[in-house]
Interface confidence: low
């Protein structure tokens, strides 16, 4: 038993650190292997992963780790019973995947204006609490090609556009994913989508 | 100005109990490691304990893991020992300290130290 | 646990001298070291870190060296508030622990 693809990791930066890594055949991930979890420095003990299958040689363990800080670094040990298989490092805050936003939610009873709000995913004793900035697709059920993407650079999870933006009369697709600048993280997964009926008053015609 | 002010230090029999504080000002005492470490009278430095900055994680030496409990609260930017059953060879001046980094390393602010005589 | 042997015990050295202390792990403890000044009835105050690392408002007459488990801590003329008693310190394997010390007075 060998690993092909050694595992990479990334971080929520909050609680959860999830690994990845592919064997050289399939394998039962969660009785055959075990990844072992330590941080360098004193302040815990060695904990055990135990790996789901992710297709048929690939293998993901979900990390648990507590207050997670920008210094912390972890020795990684994947054991297939008493051999070991692969030995590695992780440093959480430099392979940082945000948690997605929640609860997006459509404001339609603005007149003439879209409210789009959702939740912050950190607790706000959480470094990233202050740090994420958004990105909000909005698209067309019915037209593929009416695709758009704002950007939401500043720290409210909120997003105002005008309904005239959007064709009325038809129904859209909203969702949301966050990143933080600080810690060069990739995207977080997008948000559930919300749906809405897009509908505004046109304005009367200038004569 | 950083200060660090230990307190609750005296004379104990042994098999008693002590509880010191340090009083923390002049910094982000809810974002910082904080530990305490002792030296006994002419002698050394030893690492006693430490603790991250949500008091999540606890670390301490053998000497006295079970006796000795390390705690905070951020509210009052305060961090406590709580000493019990202790020895003889506990006698020593116990000073607070940050660590440098968010992680157990160098030490760059200390307290001036509380001394803490364990004796019959 | 890493044990920190740290050379000499004692010195005694003249104002002006150029002075190094030594300090041995008994394990690589990579830069995970620091150097500390304690003055007699003070607390230890923080020189050097990362073992090469000026620690902040510390006079450049302080130095640091080293990695794995030889580290040397010098100060290249010896002042008469430099008398004190010098720690190192590992803080890479667990517990941290601490050099002897080595007490450094004036000719």
């Known amino acids: 038993m060998k690993v092909l693809q050694e595992p990479t990791c990334v971080s929520d930066y909050m609680s959860i650190s999830t690994c990845e890594w592919k064997m050289n055949g399939p394998t039962n991930c969660s009785t055959e292997l075990r990844l072992l979890y330590q941080l360098v420095f004193l302040l815990s003990e060695a904990h055990t992963c135990i790996p789901e299958n992710n297709g048929g040689a690939g293998c993901v363990c979900h990390l648990l780790m507590d207050d997670v800080v920008s210094a912390d670094n972890y020795t990684l040990d994947l054991w297939a019973g008493q051999q070991l298989l692969w030995k590695g490092s992780f440093k959480p805050s430099e392979h940082v995947k945000p948690r997605a936003p929640g609860n997006l939610t459509v404001h339609t009873n603005v007149s003439d204006t879209l409210l789009l709000t959702w939740s912050n995913p950190y607790p706000p004793d959480n470094y990233l609490y202050n740090h994420l900035t958004y990105a909000v697709n909005i698209w067309s059920e019915n037209d593929p090609a009416d695709f758009r993407i704002y950007n939401v650079t500043y720290l409210e999870p909120s997003l105002r556009i005008a309904a005239s933006t959007l064709k009325s009369g038809i129904s859209y697709r909203a969702r949301v994913r966050a990143w933080a600048q600080c810690y060069n993280t990739t995207w977080s997964e997008w948000s559930p989508s919300t749906k809405w009926h897009n509908s505004y008053r046109e304005p009367f015609e200038q004569h | 100005e950083v200060q660090l002010v230990e307190s609750g230090g005296g004379l104990v029999q042994p098999g008693g109990s002590l509880r010191l504080s340090c009083a923390a000002s002049?910094?982000?005492?809810?974002?910082?490691?904080m530990s305490w470490v002792r030296q006994a009278p002419g002698k050394g430095l030893e690492y006693v304990s430490a603790?991250?900055?949500?008091?999540?994680?606890?670390y301490y030496a053998d000497s006295v893991k079970g006796r000795f409990t390390i705690s905070r609260d951020n509210s009052k930017n305060t961090l406590y020992l709580q000493m019990s059953s202790l020895r003889a060879e506990d006698t020593a001046v116990y000073y607070c300290?940050?660590?440098?980094?968010?992680?157990?390393?160098?030490?760059?602010?200390w307290g001036q130290g509380t001394s803490v005589t364990v004796s019959s | 646990d890493i044990q920190m042997t740290q050379s000499p015990s004692s010195l005694s050295a003249s104002v002006g001298d150029r002075v190094t202390i030594t300090c041995q792990a008994s394990?690589?403890?990579?830069?995970?070291l620091a150097w500390y000044q304690q003055k007699p009835g003070k607390a230890p105050k923080l020189l050097i870190y990362?073992?090469?690392n000026l620690e902040t408002g510390v006079p450049s007459r302080f130095s640091g060296s080293g990695s794995g488990t030889d580290f040397t801590f010098t100060i290249s003329s010896l002042q008469p508030e430099d008398i004190a008693t010098y720690y190192c310190?590992?803080?890479?394997?667990?517990?941290?622990?601490f050099g002897g010390g080595t007490k450094l007075e004036i000719k």
């Open positions: 300290t940050r660590q440098r980094g968010n992680y157990v390393g160098a030490m760059d602010y």
């Open positions: 002049g910094f982000t005492f809810s974002s910082s490691y």
């Open positions: 603790i991250n900055s949500n008091g999540g994680k606890t």
């Open positions: 394990q690589d403890v990579s830069t995970a």
């Open positions: 990362s073992a090469s």
């Open positions: 310190h590992q803080y890479y394997g667990s517990p941290p622990t």
